[in-house]
Each structure stands twice: as structure tokens, then as C-alpha cells.
Interface confidence: medium
């Protein structure tokens, strides 16, 4: 939190949150456990909805410990599922390009450029 | 940046009703569990209510100081938080926040005064 | 039930060092808090969460002189070299979800003033 609500929101805290609590299915107690579920389905549905991929890319799951790394494999899960590009049934569309980090098969834009932008966008 | 911004404080008789909102931006706000918080003048804080996401069914909690009294709610397609208040009590006033899902991010506040 | 207790009152002089002490209900002695700030005729402010282990992670733009540490039931706040806009109220704040019900509590707070 900053001096001021103006200077209040930079992507630091969210990042923190995310990499801590996202997919963390290890708390040590129920007041950890409805943080991480809130914080799993937020990121899911927000990477789901505004085709985003983390706070700042698809690079926050590779260069930064988490939760997530911890639960998954770096092979099969180099970013999580929400990150790769959907059909209309909501599956990845090529899970394997997805997956290899194929341009067009996976969301190389980060959530906060999004979230943060014009203050009418939701 | 986030902002929450509440509106709809004011004077209201006892048992009399109302309703507060808080209009939500630099979120994306239908992803979020959202809270009301009070505060009464010169006391702690309280927490009120919390409203969950569509994903988890809009599920609905409320201390027992307000239940079967207030009612929270929130319209996603506008980015707004309510919270209806009836059978207002004295022992209501306070100033209402709109805080959000881990209680990270609070609004200004907005008033309630219940007197006769 | 869920309780989080807090001295109501402290002083310290400008420079100085301050802990400030949040005590969880004994069977909830492992359970992570908040700690806020709120100054007079403002919101609170996120100021860290502060786990059972002592690790915390602090708001964006808190000073680093913030920092906190746990020990048992008990959660600490310390601020060193205290400043003129470190006076406020502190208050602790712990979450608990069981059983689809939830509550989230808060402490009576901590009148920090700065001599």
C-alpha cells in the first residue's frame, strides 16, 4: 500500500499474492486455505477472460519461485493451462504449442498492462 | 490504480432502510470477492459482509450483527458492490468501506448515521 | 471463536524503534494476520501478512523500516527510526473460512503516537 490511493496500485503486491497463493494446495490452515482459493480463482478467471498470462508475461512462472512451480512440473506445465490460447470450449487450442511456448498458442501479455489501463475498462 | 469509491451514506431513521454502493475500477472486478467493513465513530473496525465471484456462485456471508438484515450484492457488468441495509439500528452508524477480496485494497468511506 | 487482542496504547520518541504486539486466541495460535495502519480521518491502510513462521510480505510503497515477526499466538509489527507519519492506529486483522462459513476479524487497535 502507498502514501496515497494514486500511487497505490503497481503490479508488486498482485505478483507477490500470485506466486505465493496460486494453485498453493498446501496451506497450513483454513484461514491460508480460502486466501489461496479466492487467489487461484481470480487469476484463473482473469487470464481466462482478458487473455493475459500472469502479472507481467508468461516469464512470471519461469523466472520467479512459486506455489504453482512447486505443484507442477516445468514440462508439462510451463505456465498454467488459463495462459494458453482457448477454443470456444474453453480447452487450449494446440496444448503442445501452447506448451513449447508456440507465438499465437499461448498469451504473452501480462494481466496487470490490462487491468490497469483506462479506469472505465470494467 | 484501484479504486473504490462508495456512495449512498446519509441520515436515516431507526428501522428506516438504505443503500450503499461502491463503484470498482483498475480491477477486474468480476474475479474478486468483495467486503463491506465498518467502523463506528471513535471504535474499531467491523467486518460486515462478502460477496464471492460468479465462479463461486455469488456465495454470500455476513456477520451476525447484520444478518437477516443487510443483504450484499453486486453487478459485475457495471463494476458495483451494494449493500441493502433495512431495519437500520442506532447501533449501525458508522462509516462503511468497500474493501476487496483479501482485504488489500480499501475505499474513502461512506457515511451512515442512524438517529430519530 | 476466532479473537485477536491488542494493547490499546503506545508512545515512542522520534528515531526510536517500536513492536507492537498482536495475540491470536490460543487455538488459532498458527493462523497468518493483517496488520493496517490507519491515520486520523483515513481509510486503513495494507501494511504486511504476517505468517506463523514470521515471514511477511509488506504493501506496495510501506518503508522498509516496517518489517514483522511472530512468536507463538503472538504477531509483531516493529517500525524503526520512527516518524512524525508513523503516528496512527495499528490494527491487526485475521480471516477464517470453515465449514462454508466465513468471518473475518479485526483487532481493537493500537494508538501508536510519536513523541
Known amino acids: 500500500t502507498a502514501a496515497t490511493q494514486q500511487d497505490f496500485f503497481t503490479p508488486n503486491l498482485f505478483l507477490k499474492q500470485m506466486l505465493e497463493r496460486y494453485q498453493n494446495n498446501s496451506p497450513p490452515n483454513n484461514d491460508d486455505q480460502w486466501k489461496n482459493n479466492g487467489v487461484t480463482k481470480t487469476w484463473d478467471r482473469l487470464m481466462l477472460q482478458d487473455n493475459c498470462c500472469g502479472v507481467n508475461g508468461p516469464s512470471d512462472w519461469q523466472k520467479y519461485t512459486s506455489a504453482f512451480r512447486t505443484e507442477n512440473n516445468d514440462a508439462d506445465y510451463p505456465w498454467p493451462r488459463q495462459c494458453c490460447v482457448m477454443n470456444n470450449l474453453k480447452e487450449p487450442l494446440n496444448l503442445e504449442a501452447c506448451k513449447l511456448g508456440v507465438p499465437g498458442f499461448y498469451h504473452n501479455q501480462g494481466c496487470y498492462e490490462l487491468i490497469s489501463g483506462p479506469m472505465n475498462r470494467h | 490504480e484501484v479504486q473504490l469509491v462508495e456512495t449512498g451514506g446519509g441520515l436515516v431513521q431507526p428501522k428506516g432502510s438504505l443503500k450503499l454502493s461502491c463503484a470498482a475500477s483498475?480491477?477486474?472486478?468480476?474475479?474478486?470477492?468483495m467486503n463491506w467493513v465498518r467502523q463506528a465513530p471513535g471504535k474499531g473496525l467491523e467486518w460486515v459482509a462478502r460477496?464471492?465471484?460468479?465462479?463461486?456462485?455469488?456465495?454470500?456471508y455476513y456477520a451476525d450483527s447484520v444478518k437477516d438484515r443487510f443483504t450484499i450484492s453486486r453487478d459485475d457488468s457495471q463494476s458495483m458492490l451494494y449493500l441493502q441495509m433495512n431495519n437500520l439500528k442506532t447501533e449501525d452508524t458508522a462509516m462503511y468501506y468497500c474493501?476487496?477480496?483479501?482485504?488489500?485494497?480499501w475505499g474513502q468511506g461512506t457515511t451512515l448515521t442512524v438517529s430519530s | 471463536q476466532l479473537v485477536v487482542t491488542q494493547s490499546s496504547s503506545a508512545s515512542f520518541s522520534l528515531g526510536a524503534s517500536a513492536k507492537l504486539t498482536c495475540t491470536l486466541s490460543?487455538?488459532?495460535?498458527?493462523?497468518?494476520i493483517e496488520w493496517y495502519q490507519q491515520q486520523p480521518l483515513k481509510p486503513p491502510k495494507y501494511v504486511m501478512e504476517?505468517?506463523?513462521?514470521?515471514?511477511?510480505s509488506t504493501g506496495d510503497g510501506i518503508p522498509d523500516r516496517f518489517s514483522g515477526s511472530s512468536s507463538g499466538a503472538d504477531r509483531y509489527l516493529s517500525i524503526s527510526n520512527m516518524q512524525p507519519e508513523d503516528e496512527a492506529i495499528y490494527i491487526c486483522?485475521?480471516?477464517?473460512?470453515?465449514?462454508?462459513?466465513?468471518?473475518?476479524?479485526f483487532g481493537g487497535g493500537t494508538k501508536v503516537t510519536v513523541l
Open positions: 490460543s487455538q488459532h495460535s498458527t493462523y497468518t
Open positions: 474493501v476487496t477480496s483479501l482485504f488489500d485494497y
Open positions: 483498475g480491477l477486474s472486478f468480476n474475479t474478486y470477492a
Open positions: 486483522g485475521v480471516g477464517e473460512a470453515i465449514k462454508e462459513q466465513f468471518v473475518y476479524v
Open positions: 460477496i464471492r465471484s460468479k465462479s463461486n456462485n455469488y456465495a454470500t
Open positions: 504476517l505468517k506463523k513462521d514470521g515471514s511477511h
